[in-house]
Structure formats: structure tokens, C-alpha cells
Amino acid sequence: MGRARDAILDALENLTAEELKKFKLKLLSVPLREGYGRIPRGALLSMDALDLTDKLVSFYLETYGAELTANVLRDMGLQEMAGQLQAATHQGSGAAPAGIQAPPQSAAKPGLHFIDQHRAALIARVTNVEWLLDALYGKVLTDEQYQAVRAEPTNPSKMRKLFSFTPAWNWTCKDLLLQALRESQSYLVEDLERS
């Protein structure tokens, strides 16, 4: 993981300021695979190469993000750069075979917190729910909410109940949940981050 991201970044950092501007404009109109959204114009136009790389990877994941970048570069007449990008992403990278993509809903959205991005995976994979509840009690969760989550019979149903309260949370509340996850199931956070 990360090879495609690095290859995208290398390609974008090698563009002139004018070419990067052209790249962004083409990105606004390039045909997208079904189920994938477009990066908002306002955010897109102000980005540098690093931010744009992160946004491409968060919106389209690494494999499709690299493919999309290569398509835009080709469309700009930068065939050699597009070829180098695709070669770099397939060089023993263990990249997913063409046509096999992670579902688009797992891609990050701008301004979407880590716990919102990975809601489904967290519901399915968090096992240490009681520990999370104790960490959040009094800071983020009321006594009533704490008891409601604890009353659920299984870990997934506990997490689903916990997530039923998150729409009312602000960013810092979500950060406290993330901190608790880092402390109790660090390997899971790492794994989700790599995805």
C-alpha cells in the first residue's frame, strides 16, 4: 500500500503550475466510474500537489485514483508521464487486478472524520466496546446513552447504537472516540488507515 499514492504525487509534482491548473480543470469534467463522486470545484482549484494527491486517494482509493490520474495526463498529451505512473503502480505493488475496486463508499469525503469514513468497518470489527464506553462516558456520552449502548446484546449492535448518537457530535467528540480506538485497538485503526 502507498505505492500508488507516491506515484500519483510524483507525477503531480512534476507538472508545471500551468499544467497542474489544466489537470484540475480536466478533473472536473473527466468521466468517472459509476458510484464515484467528483471532488468539489472550490476545494480542488486551491490545492497543491500534495493536497490533490491526498484528495484523489481519499475520493477514489489508490488503484482507481492512479488510473484516473493517468487518464487525465493522457488527455493532456502527457503520454510518457501517464505510462510511468501506471508502470510505477503495477511494479510488484500487489495492486488490485484491473476492474476489481473497493466499494466507492469506503473512500473518504472532504471534511469527513475518520470514524465517519469507516463507520461500517468499525461496527463490524470493534470488539472492545465496553472500554470505549468507559473512555467516552461523561465526555461525549450521557449516562442514558452509555446505558443504552451497554444494553445491546452484541458488539456490532453496541457499535451501531453508539453510531446512532454520532450525528449530533462535533469533530472533537469524534476525535475522542478515535483516541479511544487508537488506545484499545490500534491495529484496527492502522488497518483502516491503510485501506
Epitope: A43, S46, R182, S186, E190, L192
Partner: antibody, heavy 122, light 107 residues
């Protein structure tokens, strides 16, 4: 490119307040957290807290709780850090910083302002 | 709060030598550690994040390793511009904290 430009140096009296600004450009202001870190002369770095301009929520280092207030003005893409009840030990360079990205599971500071020296002296 | 202790406080080496800087956390922080370089009158500069990931634009002579409570920043062959103060920072829990720094000076 991403830029964080801070306000100029300040000299303040003990007991007063200081408000330092950090003007952001080069990315969508509401998408990323902005943190404040200070450094006393010849000393190490100390995290003060952050704001998420998207919803205006802030988190503070408890050491400064009640004395520090971090705010953001979306209309000007500017973050502010106000420190009250100043004492001589608050003399430091105050930095605003932006993480590599905020939607990941951590905060590593890839972008920094140039720093603002605040001197507290009677 | 999590306390990060860096050692040594000062490291005196010559260009071309290998530098090894340590950072010890008071409790388990898994891999949530970064390293910064700071030169006089400048803001810190991110070198390594998540223990071992090299930040964009940082030369490959810098590398990071470790997990749990013990971490290392290695500079394989020192260049004149590498002499500076280095800080570690934990991202595991709030408040975020930094080590007290290691000053890397020319011998």
C-alpha cells in the same frame, strides 16, 4: 500552495491578553484542523490545542484550559488563538500548524506558520 | 499525559557519520509517533510520521523505526544541513506531546 501567515510580534503586560492570527491559503479552510503550538525561548514544543473550522469545535490542552481560546473566521480563512491572564512564562514563539491531513487517524504537522513572538514583560 | 523522553540531549558527530536519536514514551503509543527537525529561527519541519513513514521531499538518509514505547530516528550519513534540533511527537492521545529535543551538533 498551502500557506499559513501569522500576525506580527507582540509585547504584552502581565495579566493582559494576546490574540494571534493565522491566515490560511492554498486549500479549503473548513476541511482541516488548525493547531497551535508554542515554544518558549531555548525550550521545546508545547501543543496548546486545535480548532476544526468546519464546525467551530475546539480541543485544548488542559494545562491552558480556561486561559486559551481558539476560534476561526470562515469568511477570511483565518484562525485565532487568544491567551489571557498572561505571565512572564508565556513569553514564547506561537505557531499555527496544519496536519498532513485531518481525516486520517492522527495529527502530524506538515505545514507551519512562520511563528509569532509574544513577549510578556512589565 | 504521555511523556516523551529523548536521548541523548546533545549528540556531537561529524558529516558523513551515522546518527541515532532515541525517543522513549512513558506508555504504549503503538506507532503513533512523528519526528521533526528545527533550525534556529525556523518553524519545525516534519520528517517522519507514523514511526517510519518518510514525509514527502525528505531525503532517504532519514529513517524511523520502533513501536510501543521505544522509537529511533536514524540519519544514515550526515550532511552539513542536518545539524539542528530534533523533536519527537506522539499522536496517540490528547494532549499531543513532544519530546524535549535532541541537539545534533558538529563535532
Amino acid at each position: 500552495q498551502v500557506q499559513l501567515v501569522q500576525s506580527g510580534a507582540e509585547v504584552k503586560k502581565p495579566g493582559s491578553s494576546v490574540k494571534v492570527s493565522c491566515k490560511i491559503s492554498g486549500y479549503s479552510f473548513t476541511d482541516q484542523t488548525i493547531h497551535w503550538v508554542r515554544q518558549a525561548p531555548g525550550q521545546g514544543l508545547e501543543w496548546m490545542g486545535y480548532i476544526y473550522p468546519g464546525d467551530g469545535s475546539a480541543m485544548y490542552n488542559e494545562k491552558f484550559q480556561g486561559r486559551v481560546t481558539i476560534t476561526a473566521d470562515k469568511s477570511t480563512s483565518t484562525a485565532y488563538m487568544e491567551l489571557s491572564s498572561l505571565r512572564s512564562e508565556d513569553t514564547a514563539v506561537y505557531y499555527c500548524a496544519r496536519p498532513l491531513y485531518s481525516y486520517a487517524s492522527y495529527y502530524w504537522f506538515a505545514y507551519w506558520g512562520q511563528g509569532t513572538l509574544v513577549t510578556v514583560s512589565s | 499525559e504521555i511523556v516523551l523522553t529523548q536521548s541523548p540531549a546533545t549528540l556531537s558527530l561529524s558529516p558523513g557519520e551515522r546518527a541515532t536519536l532515541s525517543c522513549h514514551a512513558s506508555q504504549n503509543i503503538n506507532v503513533w509517533l512523528s519526528w521533526y527537525q528545527q533550525k534556529p529561527g525556523q518553524a519545525p519541519r516534519l520528517l517522519i510520521y507514523k514511526s517510519s513513514n518518510l514525509h514527502t521531499g525528505i531525503p532517504a538518509r532519514f529513517s524511523g523505526s520502533g513501536s510501543g514505547t521505544d522509537f529511533t530516528l536514524t540519519i544514515s550519513s550526515l550532511e552539513p544541513e542536518d545539524f539542528a534540533v530534533y523533536y519527537c511527537q506522539q499522536g496517540q492521545s490528547y494532549p499531543l506531546t513532544f519530546g524535549q529535543g535532541t541537539k545534533l551538533e558538529i563535532k
